[in-house]
Interface confidence: low
Amino acid sequence: SGVFQLQLQEFINERGVLASGRPCEPGCRTFFRVCLKHFQAVVSPGPCTFGTVSTPVLGTNSFAVRDDSSGGGRNPLQLPFNFTWPGTFSLIIEAWHAPGDDLRPEALPPDALISKIAIQGSLAVGQNWLLDEQTSTLTRLRYSYRVICSDNYYGDNCSRLCKKRNDHFGHYVCQPDGNLSCLPGWTGEYCQQPICLSGCHEQNGYCSKPAECLCRPGWQGRLCNECIPHNGCRHGTCSTPWQCTCDEGWGGLFCDQDLNYCTHHSPCKNGATCSNSGQRSYTCTCRPGYTGVDCELELSECDSNPCRNGGSCKDQEDGYHCLCPPGYYGLHCEHSTLSCADSPCFNGGSCRERNQGANYACECPPNFTGSNCEKKVDRCTSNPCANGGQCLNRGPSRMCRCRPGFTGTYCELHVSDCARNPCAHGGTCHDLENGLMCTCPAGFSGRRCEVRTSIDACASSPCFNRATCYTDLSTDTFVCNCPYGFVGSRCEFPVGLPPSFPW
């Protein structure tokens, strides 16, 4: 929506004659009729599709026109339009002589025309006036014109509606091209989103007005980056809300129970090692020769049963001595003297003699390990599954459970992202390392070729009554060139009455 403005400045008719050459009596009382229409290569009669306007009598013969209201008429003359400005136009300006006060076309003599000019061309929207002068053999007209947008309309064609606002629905003013310009402290497509206090945590904080930082439940602090621990948490902290992770030495649901009894009370005697094991609970690990809850009782050396594998203990003045049963030796009878004859290999392991029978080694079957084949092998310890697959033990074998997008025994194969034909409108799919890419055919764009990029505004045949459709010069809109007898932006209205002015 906009206005074509025409400012008449000076009209010269020194001899005071009509177009026919006949003089006006007593002088040429001059008024103007203006017709604005769609672009025509050769301006021809027909409906003024963009509008018409006429003036009262502005002067006699030669005169200057004041640039304000004059005798009830307006200067500049206003020709409003409520469609997208097409960028081209045709303009007809006629000067007429009014013998009397009735300026209606039917009240004037047929030869009352003083002069007529017709121009056409391109005209961009803008504040600057185009100054022009048109001279004929007997007259000269100086005038200027421009196209400006109506209030709240912007852009090269006055097609963008934008109304500044500062309320719940948006906080913005309008730029010259009609795009929104957010007021300070606001962002988003319609400037509805406040810009929070600088540093306000993205997930844990929010704001309802600029420079604010309101915390979501479970968070606190100026920037909402400190979690709130469980209510009543005494000696603990949190890394996520409502946790109570106890400081060292404290326990219980609220970290209010003292667990560091060892440090505070030193209950273990005779050089024993103290271990905390709960609230007011501890364990003393006694040195050899001591026993009791706090290792407060002295033992004989053999009271601690130091001899292993069934060895018997003998107290001695300087300690103790172990008498080992057959097949064992060492200070505590801890070493075996078994051989392959004693069948030491478990789970079907094969025994091999070493050092002339003084020792042996077990060769284990699959899935077992250890010096006596006593341990079951975990086949997943080597992390055989690629691309984040999960390893599962399945009896004598293992298997990999793959993440989405991968397959194969060890999840080593990448499933093709193109297999599901994700590219729309005949786009070509290319597998990439981290996803896919679509190559779009002409007329489409977007990550999946889902966006139609070129539109022929005339393709939908918007013009009625056999009118000719032209695509606009600068936007994907249309202009209808109406045949004689029809008007309107789509040539949809028949002219029921004779036209107001005989163009």
Epitope: S122, A124, L130, D132, L473
Partner: nanobody, 116 residues
Framework: EVQLVESGGGLVQAGGSLRLSCAAA????????MGWYRQAPGKQRELVAH???????YYADSVKGRFTISRDNAKNTMYLQMNSLKPEDTAVYYC??????????WGQGTQVTVSS
């Protein structure tokens, strides 16, 4: 006063191409709206294409997609690239310019003949 000189016309077979040039003598070429018109024998002169001071282009339906109008303000020259020529494109092609769309200036014309 503005002088316009067209060149580049000639005889070409249907489906061929030609490039017309229009050189303008005048220091304010960039502020002129430029256009190409043509007149076939026994017919009215018709608009082919025009280009605004900002480079906005307009084409007659009969040449859309085949002809391309352009201007080089540094060389004070306007061009018309004509592809996929048809016998019905045969005409005298005129270069036209307007200062503020009122003062009309025309070149002398260049003949384009398309044989079938």
């Amino acid at each position: 006063e503005v002088q316009l000189v067209e060149s580049g016309g000639g005889l070409v077979q249907a489906g061929g191409s030609l490039r017309l040039s229009c050189a303008a003598a005048g220091s304010t070429f960039s502020s002129y709206v430029m256009g190409w018109y043509r007149q076939a024998p026994g017919k009215q002169r018709e608009l082919v294409a025009h280009i605004s001071t900002r480079g906005i282009t307009y084409y007659a339906d009969s040449v859309k997609g085949r002809f391309t109008i352009s201007r080089d303000n540094a060389k004070n020259t306007m061009y018309l690239q004509m592809n996929s020529l048809k016998p019905e494109d045969t005409a005298v092609y005129y270069c036209n310019t307007r200062r503020n769309f009122l003062s009309n200036y025309w070149g002398q014309g260049t003949q384009v003949t398309v044989s079938s």
